[in-house]
Interface confidence: low
C-alpha cells in the first residue's frame, strides 16, 4: 500500500541555527522515506532535505542548515514519502520566515527602582545576541511579587533601532521586592523564545500605607482607672518590607475632644491607663517619606453593655488549615476581630489578632500555629465604632497523644469495691482536647477489663471485684490521635469488710 | 579566564588624537559593557563613557564634550576609545574595564593593565 | 550628577587596626555603591558592590555596609597588603562617578 499522506507539516526557524520541520507521519507498515522539498529565496532557488534515520520518529523532521537560510524569506514546503508501492505528496505549505523565527531568551541584568518615580521599577536587558537585524522583537514580561505565585503579564514591542533596551514597569507596590522575567519574538514571529533568567528588584519605598489597631481591655483597677493594650500592625496588603520610624498616639475622651493626650512610641503595642467613660484613639506610622492615614478606634466605657450576636462557633481542621466558622443573628455585622494565644498558665504575651469582612469563617495555615498547643481563640463583632461580646473556643491546630498519662490514685479499697481517682493531665502535656479517660484494670494471673468514661469524669468506681486479690490498674487519657497510659498502680481487696 | 589587554603607552602633541584599543578574551565579548576609565598623575579616577559591544549602544561622560569616541569590533573582541583635540592635562593613564554584569550592575570587575597616554609639546 | 564625598582622603593605621571610610552621596542610590582599592602603578581592584556583596576572592575582612546616601567600607584588621588607596563608585546609572579616595597609609 501507499504511505499514508503526511499530515500537520510545521516548520520553526532556530534563528541563525537551522530550519526545522516537523510533520505527522501517519501509520506506516513498511519502511518510509521522507523528502522534504522547499523553494526559497523568494522562489528563486529549491532544494531537498531527506531523511535518513531509522527510527520513525526522527524520519519525521527535517532541517536546513546555514548558509542556505534567508530572512526575510518566504519558502513553500512540502514532503513526499515514498515506500516500495510508490510516492505520495502532502499539500504545498506555505512559510514567511519572519513568522517562524524564534530566538534566544533575551539577558536581563539590571531591575533597579528610579529615583523619585513611585511605584515603578525599570528592567533593562541585552536582546538575544542572535535576533533578526531586519526585524523588530516583541516582548512578554512577566512579574510577581517574591512571595506570590502567580504572574502578571505584559506584552509590549521595541523598535529594531531602538538602542534602549529598558521598559518602565508601573503601577506597582511600594517597597516591594518583585521577580521579573522577559521573553522575546520576532515581531511577526507565532514563537516566543524561552523565558530569561528571573531576576529581582525592588520599588522606592513610600510613607506607611496604613495600620491596623486593635485593643484589648483590662479589668479596672482600684482608682477606677482601667489599663488598656493598644496593639497595632501594617494594615492588610501593606509591602511586606515597609518600615516605619515611628507612631505617634492621641486619645480623647469622646465627651470632651479637648482633653487629648498624645505620646510617641517605636512598640507596636502601648499600655493605656484611661478613665471609665468612652475613649477615641487615634494613630498614625510615620517614616522618612511621611505619614500613613489615621487609624481610629472606640474604647467602650467601662460600664457600657455590648452587643451579642454570635450564636454558635466550632473550629475544625481541614486540608492543613484550622478553620473556625460561626453563626450570627445579626445579619448587619460583617466584619469580626479574631484574636488568638496559645493557652498557657502564664499571662499570654503571643496575642495575635486578624479582621474578617464579609464572612463567617476564618482559617490560618496549621504551620502557623504550634502542634499539640491549645489555642484560646475569641471571635468580636465589629458594627460601625462598636465592638461586641466575644465568643471563644478552645482549638488545637494539630492533635497528638499527651507526653504524660493521668496521676492515678487508688481509693476507699473495699472487699469487692475500690475508687480510682485522677487528675487532669497539665495543658503543657496534653497535646490534644482529651475526649475520654479509659480505666484498663486486672487481677494477678487473670483477664484484663476496662472502662472508658468521657472526659469530665476524674474518678470511676470498680464492683464487682475479688476478695484479698493483687489489682493492677492503670488509666489511659485519649485525644484524636490516641492514648497515653499513667503509670500502674496495685492494690489488693480486703479479706473481708468491718460490716461482716 | 576573563583578560582585558590594552595597547601600549603613547606619547602624543596637544591637539592630536589618540586611540586606545583593549582585546577581550575569556567571556562572550557581545555579553558584556566595556567601560573606559582615566587616572591623571597622582589624581582619583575619572569615568569617560562605555560600550555595549552587542548593539554598540554608547554612553559618555557629558564632560568630554564630543571629544572621545569608544567602539567596538566584534569580530576581534576588541574595544577602543579615541580622544581628540588632546590638550596636557589629557595626560593619564587610560583603562579598560568590563561591566560586573556577574556581579553588580555598573560595576567594574576586570581592568585592563592601563596605557599610560602622554601629552607634550 | 551624583557626587561622591569620600572620607578622609588619607589616613595613617597600624598592621591589625580596625579602619572605616565613609562615602556619603549628593542623592539617594539604595544600595548601589562599590569599592575599589588600587594599589601604586596597579589597576583598581573591585572589592565590594551593592554597598557589602564582597566580589568574589576578597578576603572576609573587607566589609561594606550603607544604603540611601551614607556608606562605609570597613576593614576589621588590617594586613600588610592592604595599604593602599579606596575609592568609591556609584553604580546606580550613568554617567558613573568616584569618590576622592583614601590613602591608608603605614603609622
Known amino acids: 500500500a501507499l504511505p499514508a499522506k503526511p499530515e500537520n507539516i510545521s516548520c520553526v526557524y532556530y534563528y541563525r541555527k537551522n530550519l526545522t520541520c516537523t510533520w505527522s507521519p501517519g501509520k506506516e507498515t513498511s519502511y518510509t522515506q521522507y523528502t522534504v522539498k522547499r523553494t526559497y529565496a523568494f522562489g528563486e532557488k529549491h532544494d531537498n532535505c531527506t531523511t535518513n534515520s531509522s527510527t520513525s520518529e526522527n524520519r519525521a523532521s527535517c532541517s536546513f542548515f546555514l548558509p542556505r537560510i534567508t530572512i526575510p524569506d518566504n519558502y513553500t514546503i512540502e514532503v513526499e514519502a515514498e515506500n516500495g508501492d510508490g510516492v505520495i505528496k502532502s499539500h504545498m505549505t506555505y512559510w514567511r520566515l519572519e513568522n517562524i523565527a524564534k530566538t534566544e531568551p533575551p539577558k536581563i541584568f539590571r531591575v533597579k527602582p528610579v529615583l523619585g518615580i513611585k511605584r515603578m521599577i525599570q528592567i533593562e536587558w541585552i536582546k538575544p545576541e542572535l535576533a533578526p537585524v531586519s526585524s523588530d522583537l516583541k516582548y512578554t514580561l512577566r512579574f510577581r511579587t517574591v512571595n506570590s505565585t502567580s504572574w502578571m503579564e505584559v506584552n509590549f514591542a521595541k523598535n529594531r533601532k531602538d538602542k534602549n533596551q529598558t521598559y518602565n514597569l508601573t503601577g506597582l507596590q511600594p517597597f516591594t521586592e518583585y521577580v521579573i522575567a522577559l521573553r522575546c519574538a520576532v515581531k511577526e514571529s507565532k514563537f516566543w523564545s524561552d523565558w530569561s533568567q528571573e531576576k529581582m528588584g525592588m520599588t522606592e519605598e513610600e510613607a506607611p500605607c496604613g495600620l491596623e489597631l486593635w485593643r484589648v481591655l483590662k479589668p479596672a483597677e482600684a482608682d477606677g482607672r482601667r489599663p488598656v493594650r493598644l496593639l497595632w500592625k501594617k494594615a492588610r496588603g501593606a509591602p511586606v518590607l515597609e518600615k516605619t520610624l515611628g507612631y505617634n498616639i492621641w486619645y480623647y475622651p469622646e465627651s470632651n475632644t479637648n482633653l487629648t493626650e498624645t505620646m510617641n512610641t517605636t512598640n507596636q503595642q502601648l499600655e493605656l491607663h484611661l478613665g471609665g467613660e468612652s475613649f477615641w484613639v487615634s494613630m498614625i506610622s510615620y517614616n522618612s517619606l511621611g505619614k500613613s492615614p489615621v487609624a481610629t478606634l472606640r474604647i467602650p466605657a467601662i460600664q457600657e453593655k455590648s452587643f451579642q450576636c454570635i450564636e454558635v462557633m466550632q473550629a475544625c481542621v481541614a486540608e492543613d488549615q484550622l478553620v473556625v466558622k460561626w453563626q450570627s443573628s445579626a445579619l448587619d455585622v460583617n466584619t469580626w476581630m479574631i484574636e488568638w494565644f496559645p493557652d498557657v498558665d502564664s499571662e499570654p504575651t503571643t496575642l495575635s489578632w486578624e479582621s474578617v469582612s464579609q464572612a463567617t469563617n476564618w482559617t490560618i495555615q496549621q504551620d502557623k500555629l504550634k502542634p499539640f498547643w491549645c489555642y484560646n481563640i475569641s471571635v468580636y463583632p465589629m458594627l460601625h465604632d462598636k465592638v461586641g461580646e466575644p465568643y471563644s473556643i478552645q482549638a488545637y491546630a494539630k492533635e497528638g497523644v499527651p507526653s504524660e498519662g493521668p496521676e492515678t490514685k487508688v481509693e476507699n479499697i473495699g472487699v469487692k469495691t475500690v475508687t480510682i481517682t485522677w487528675k487532669e493531665i497539665p495543658k503543657s502535656e496534653r497535646k490534644g482536647i482529651i475526649c475520654n479517660y479509659t480505666i484498663f484494670y486486672q487481677a494477678e494471673g487473670g483477664k484484663g477489663f476496662s472502662k472508658t468514661v468521657n472526659s469530665s469524669i476524674l474518678q470511676y468506681g470498680l464492683e464487682s471485684l475479688k476478695r484479698k486479690t493483687s489489682y493492677i490498674v492503670q488509666v489511659m487519657a485519649s485525644t484524636s490521635a490516641g492514648g497515653t497510659n499513667g503509670t500502674s498502680i496495685n492494690f489488693k481487696t480486703l479479706s473481708f469488710s468491718v460490716f461482716e | 579566564q576573563v583578560q582585558l589587554v590594552q595597547s601600549g603607552a603613547e606619547v602624543k602633541k596637544p591637539g592630536a588624537s589618540v586611540k586606545v584599543s583593549c582585546k577581550a578574551s575569556?567571556?562572550?565579548?557581545?555579553?558584556?559593557?566595556i567601560n573606559w576609565v582615566r587616572q591623571a598623575p597622582g589624581q582619583g579616577l575619572e569615568w569617560m563613557g562605555l560600550?555595549?559591544?552587542?548593539?554598540?549602544?554608547?554612553d559618555y561622560n557629558q564632560k568630554f564634550k564630543g571629544r572621545v569616541t569608544i567602539t567596538a569590533d566584534e569580530s576581534t573582541s576588541t574595544a577602543y576609545m579615541e580622544l581628540s583635540s588632546l590638550r596636557s592635562e589629557d595626560t593619564a593613564v587610560y583603562y579598560c574595564a568590563r561591566d560586573g554584569y556577574d556581579d553588580g550592575p555598573y560595576t567594574m570587575d576586570y581592568w585592563g593593565q592601563g596605557t599610560l597616554v602622554t601629552v607634550s609639546s | 550628577d551624583i557626587q561622591m564625598t569620600q572620607s578622609p582622603s588619607s589616613l595613617s593605621a597600624s598592621v591589625g587596626d580596625r579602619v572605616t571610610i565613609t562615602c556619603q552621596t549628593s542623592?539617594?542610590?539604595?544600595?548601589?555603591v562599590a569599592w575599589y582599592q588600587q594599589k601604586p602603578g596597579k589597576a583598581p581592584k573591585l572589592l565590594i558592590y551593592n554597598a557589602k556583596t564582597l566580589a568574589k576572592g576578597v578576603p572576609s575582612r573587607f566589609s561594606g555596609s550603607g544604603s540611601g546616601t551614607d556608606f562605609t567600607l570597613t576593614i576589621s584588621s588590617l594586613q600588610p597588603e592592604d595599604f593602599a588607596t579606596y575609592y568609591c563608585?556609584?553604580?546606580?546609572?550613568?554617567?558613573?562617578?568616584f569618590g576622592g579616595g583614601t590613602k591608608v597609609e603605614i603609622k
Open positions: 563608585q556609584h553604580h546606580y546609572d550613568s554617567p558613573l562617578t
Open positions: 560600550i555595549n559591544p552587542y548593539n554598540g549602544g554608547t
Open positions: 575569556g567571556y562572550t565579548f557581545t555579553g558584556y559593557v
Open positions: 542623592e539617594n542610590i539604595y544600595r548601589f
